[in-house]
């Protein structure tokens, strides 16, 4: 089903994608699910949304916009936002919350790029991504304040109050409500 975009556009030149599959046209596949996904558009040189049918298709398909950009846009990761301290945050700090596929109930922390703070989340116990820390300190050290001194002080107290932990049990299957962006 997947067909490659023809490579006749000479002005693409230095804009060659990182992987050959980034040049493939968006392919929704034969199935009838409606899954919001992203693909790299060779002509606009941007990652764009499309609706995936749920089976087959091709490799130019990503669950998140971030994943698409990282995989197909040359130099994207090098332009990642730098922390105020001047030290660069690892790319995984910008990954969206991913509880994984399993049904466990692990209290973890992630860096929220919107609030610019480390926050608690429920992790299912397998898979997911590297924006996932066992302790608040570890998350802060790596993503909130890379290369800086340790946090501490009033900010920690306010944050601890802000993220009162709900002790309700885990959802029965994380994958029923897995994020689609």
């Amino acid at each position: 089903l997947s067909e490659e975009a023809d490579d006749t556009d000479s002005e693409l030149g230095s804009m060659k994608p990182l992987h050959t599959f980034c040049a493939m046209k968006a392919d929704d596949g034969p199935c009838k699910a409606m899954i919001r996904s992203y693909f790299f558009n060779m002509y606009t040189h941007q990652c764009e949304e499309f609706i995936y049918g749920g089976c087959e298709g091709n490799e130019n398909r990503f669950d998140t916009l971030e994943e698409c950009k990282k995989t197909c846009i040359p130099g994207y990761e090098k332009t990642a936002v730098k922390a105020a301290s001047g030290a660069e945050r690892p790319d995984f700090c910008f990954l969206e919350e991913d509880p994984g596929l399993c049904r466990g109930y692990m209290k973890r922390y992630l860096y929220n790029n919107q609030t610019k703070q480390c926050e608690r989340f429920v992790y299912g116990g397998c898979l997911g991504n590297r924006n996932n820390f066992e302790t608040l300190d570890e998350c802060k050290k790596i993503c909130e304040n890379p290369g800086g001194g340790s946090g501490g002080g009033l900010n920690d107290i306010f944050e601890a109050q802000k993220i009162e932990w709900h002790e309700g049990g885990p959802p029965h299957h994380h994958h029923h409500h897995h994020h689609h962006h």
Epitope: D63, G124, C126, E134
Partner: antibody
Framework: EVQLLESGGGLVQPGGSLRLSCAAS????????MSWVRQAPGKGLEWVSA????????YYADSVKGRFTISRDNSKNTLYLQMNSLRAEDTAVYYC?????????????WGQGTMVTVSS | QSVLTQPPSVSGAPGQRVTISCTGS?????????VHWYQQLPGTAPKLLIY???NRPSGVPDRFSGSKSGTSASLAITGLQAEDEADYYC????????????FGGGTKLTVLG
């Protein structure tokens, strides 16, 4: 009875492609995450890929990222593994497994496996 | 080289008790991930033996038990029987690999005749 039946294995040349299928029966297929695990001849087990029940989230081992694509068709109760740019080191028995059904995060039920041989 | 380390082989006489160790690190077993154990009889697919460190699926005899402490786990088999001769694998997940599944290299259990 819960059953998983893999098919699609065979002999393929390096650089070639193959699509494995795993037909599921005896349970509500769309409710469960599924995974592929492989075992090279005489070697141990290696996790390959996993997919959520809806098919909306997929995960891959670094060794196959960019080459393999996991997908599922819930209307056909079938799991797939599209394998491209195959290498000699991909030679293995490929098992499909239900992930976290009765357990929280184990590979609960396994198929009997299908053999993939990559050789010129 | 497997992420989780198991002894390549263990052996015991019928009726004896044997243990198989599975040693990990702070990014897998030590990070709070569950450990699971699988039994693979010769020429067959693996079968879940112990899940969530110490739980037995229905149908698995209580001669099999699992435990976890710190960065390691172990599988104990008591009252060894000839049909227990198989390969045994531990499995967990690893945060340094984005939570990917990781296995031990496997342990061949020989029941001495």
């Amino acid at each position: 009875e819960v059953q998983l039946l893999e098919s699609g294995g065979g002999l393929v040349q390096p650089g070639g492609s193959l699509r494995l299928s795993c037909a599921a029966s005896g349970f509500t297929f769309s409710s469960y995450a599924m995974s592929w695990v492989r075992q090279a001849p005489g070697k141990g087990l290696e996790w390959v890929s996993a997919i959520s029940g809806s098919g909306g989230s997929t995960y891959y081992a670094d060794s196959v990222k960019g080459r393999f694509t996991i997908s599922r068709d819930n209307s056909k109760n079938t799991l797939y593994l599209q394998m491209n740019s195959l290498r000699a080191e991909d030679t293995a028995v490929y098992y499909c497994a239900i992930l976290g059904a009765t357990s929280l995060s184990a590979f609960d039920i396994w198929g009997q496996g299908t053999m993939v041989t990559v050789s010129s | 080289q497997s992420v989780l380390t198991q002894p390549p082989s263990v052996s015991g006489a019928p009726g004896q008790r044997v243990t198989i160790s599975c040693t990990g690190s702070s990014s897998n077993i030590g990070a709070g991930y569950d450990v699971h154990w699988y039994q693979q009889l010769p020429g067959t697919a693996p079968k879940l033996l112990i899940y969530g460190n110490s739980n037995r699926p229905s149908g698995v005899p209580d001669r099999f038990s699992g435990s976890k402490s710190g960065t390691s786990a172990s599988l104990a088999i008591t009252g060894l029987q000839a049909e227990d001769e198989a390969d045994y694998y531990c499995q967990s997940y690893d945060s340094s690999l984005s939570g990917s599944g990781v296995f031990g290299g496997g342990t061949k259990l020989t029941v001495l005749g």
